[in-house]
Amino acid sequence: EDELQVIQPEKSVSVAAGESATLRCAMTSLIPVGPIMWFRGAGAGRELIYNQKEGHFPRVTTVSELTKRNNLDFSISISNITPADAGTYYCVKFRKGSPDDVEFKSGAGTELSVRAKPSAPVVSGPAVRATPEHTVSFTCESHGFSPRDITLKWFKNGNELSDFQTNVDPAGDSVSYSIHSTARVVLTRGDVHSQVICEIAHITLQGDPLRGTANLSEAIRVPPTLEVTQQPMRAENQANVTCQVSNFYPRGLQLTWLENGNVSRTETASTLIENKDGTYNWMSWLLVNTCAHRDDVVLTCQVEHDGQQAVSKSYALEISAHQKEHGSDITHEAALAPTAPLGGSG
């Protein structure tokens, strides 16, 4: 008889993670007597995958019934493939021997590549908020995919971004890969409702890319603009001064009224008006009993927004000579009327 040949017909096999991989192997003869073994890798460090002779290989099944003597098919199926199973598999015929079986002939090998889906991309923004016109960085990460080829794109409100840098690790061969990308985004005042999207395309996704999103509302701080005005009043001895706090984000805001530099009242913004662009407006007002003042009053609206340094706007309230004459006996405390914010709910 001709000497036995070990035939592995496929040079490579590609399988999706979670599926079974069939590795084909056939012998041209039954001689010599001895077991068939499958290994991953070659040389001294090769890993035993299946031994016809002995052992427990729960993920491996033989495609044919090996107990049939005339069977020359030694193909195996490996279940529940993971990226860690990638490698070159060799079907090897051994001759029965002692103290160990003697390797007789090996097949040429079949390279198993595993197609593994990338994990859902996770997009994270900056740790601290930034104001419009500043640039912030967003990162996108996805892991566990194979093969290495992958495409990542960034979008802001549907418009593709170009200022980003992407790395796929590791650089060399690996069972699976990770991608990390950093995009730089210039903030604008209207970005409270904006979104950045990281989009990943990979062969395993069959044209249906994965997306991860982040809201710019988590990254932006729009500082308020202040306007202090006096409203007309019917009563001669009262002045109504309002502080209009406009176009701020996020909500957290504390307002303090000062009269001639002294704190008269502090309040926290609660009922806000939301603008179309996602920013908020709020109005506070102060009733001043002009009879209580002999001299002109400087009213200051001081706003602390989102834990930042306070901004303020002042208004000089003129006290007429007539009011000065009649109001000397009214105490400063009694001159302050209770106030409430103007405007509807936000």
């Epitope: 001689i31 007597v33 077991p35 107990t67 003597r69 029965k96 021997g97 002692s98 160990d100 079986d101």
Partner: antibody
Framework: EVQLVESGGGLVQPGGSLRLSCAAS????????MHWVRQAPGKGLEWVSA???????YYTGSVKGRFTISRENAKNSLYLQMNSLRASDTAVYYC????????????WGQGTMVTVSS | DIQMTQSPSSLSASVGDRVTITCRAS??????AAWFQQKPGKAPKSLIY???SLHSGVPSKFSGSGSGTDFTLTISSLQPEDFATYYC?????????FGQGTKLEIK
């Protein structure tokens, strides 16, 4: 059903000859290594001879040159031609099938008795 | 030739007992050791091959172990039908050789 049935045993004088047959059913005999094993009365088992799928033959030292193992594929049968028989060859002779890949004995015949006596 | 030495040559045990028979090869035989059971007037029956693999239809109360030169056959819980003679065998190289046998008798 896989089965081996031996025949051809009997009483023979020392120096005489005998041909044992083993008829296989339920499998193709030529696809397996086949063996003869004997057991002298009240004694243990002794391997005698084997024939491989390629027709290669093997014998234990005490029968070399006297016994010949062969097979006839058309009849799916195994044979043991025994010449120059001695009293020490008296035994029950079993036909045995070797296992698929390692030649471990898996199927035994019921045996046939060979008695060498004058 | 490779010699196979079995011990003990005979063994008395009771129903329900766990018994172990050992076999030593005169040189390493990898794990090409087999065990057979034979009852009086009957052909041997194959129990175990490659030291620890059970032949089809053999009950799991039989188990084998070993590699190299030392091998064991264990019967976990003896039943009346298990009283017989047991043989080990090496089949790594010709001539294949058997142990002298262990006769397992009822106590």
């Amino acid at each position: 059903e896989v089965q081996l049935v031996e025949s051809g045993g009997g009483l023979v004088q020392p120096g005489g000859s005998l041909r044992l047959s083993c008829a296989a059913s339920g499998f193709t005999l030529s696809s397996y290594d086949m063996h003869w094993v004997r057991q002298a009365p009240g004694k243990g088992l002794e391997w005698v001879s084997a024939i491989g799928t390629a027709g290669d033959t093997y014998y234990t030292g005490s029968v070399k040159g006297r016994f010949t193992i062969s097979r006839e594929n058309a009849k799916n049968s195994l044979y043991l031609q025994m010449n120059s028989l001695r009293a020490s060859d008296t035994a029950v002779y079993y036909c045995v099938r070797g296992g698929v890949w390692d030649d471990a004995f898996d199927i035994w015949g019921q045996g046939t008795m060979v008695t060498v006596s004058s | 030739d490779i010699q196979m030495t079995q011990s003990p040559s005979s063994l008395s045990a009771s129903v329900g007992d766990r018994v172990t028979i050992t076999c030593r090869a005169s040189q390493g035989i990898n794990n090409y050791a087999a065990w057979f059971q034979q009852k009086p007037g009957k052909a041997p029956k194959s129990l175990i091959y490659t030291a620890s693999s059970l032949h089809s239809g053999v009950p799991s109360k039989f188990s084998g172990s070993g590699s190299g030169t030392d091998f064991t056959l264990t019967i976990s819980s003896l039943q009346p039908e298990d009283f017989a003679t047991y043989y080990c065998q090496q089949y790594v190289s010709y001539p294949y050789t058997f142990g002298q046998g262990t006769k397992l008798e009822i106590k």
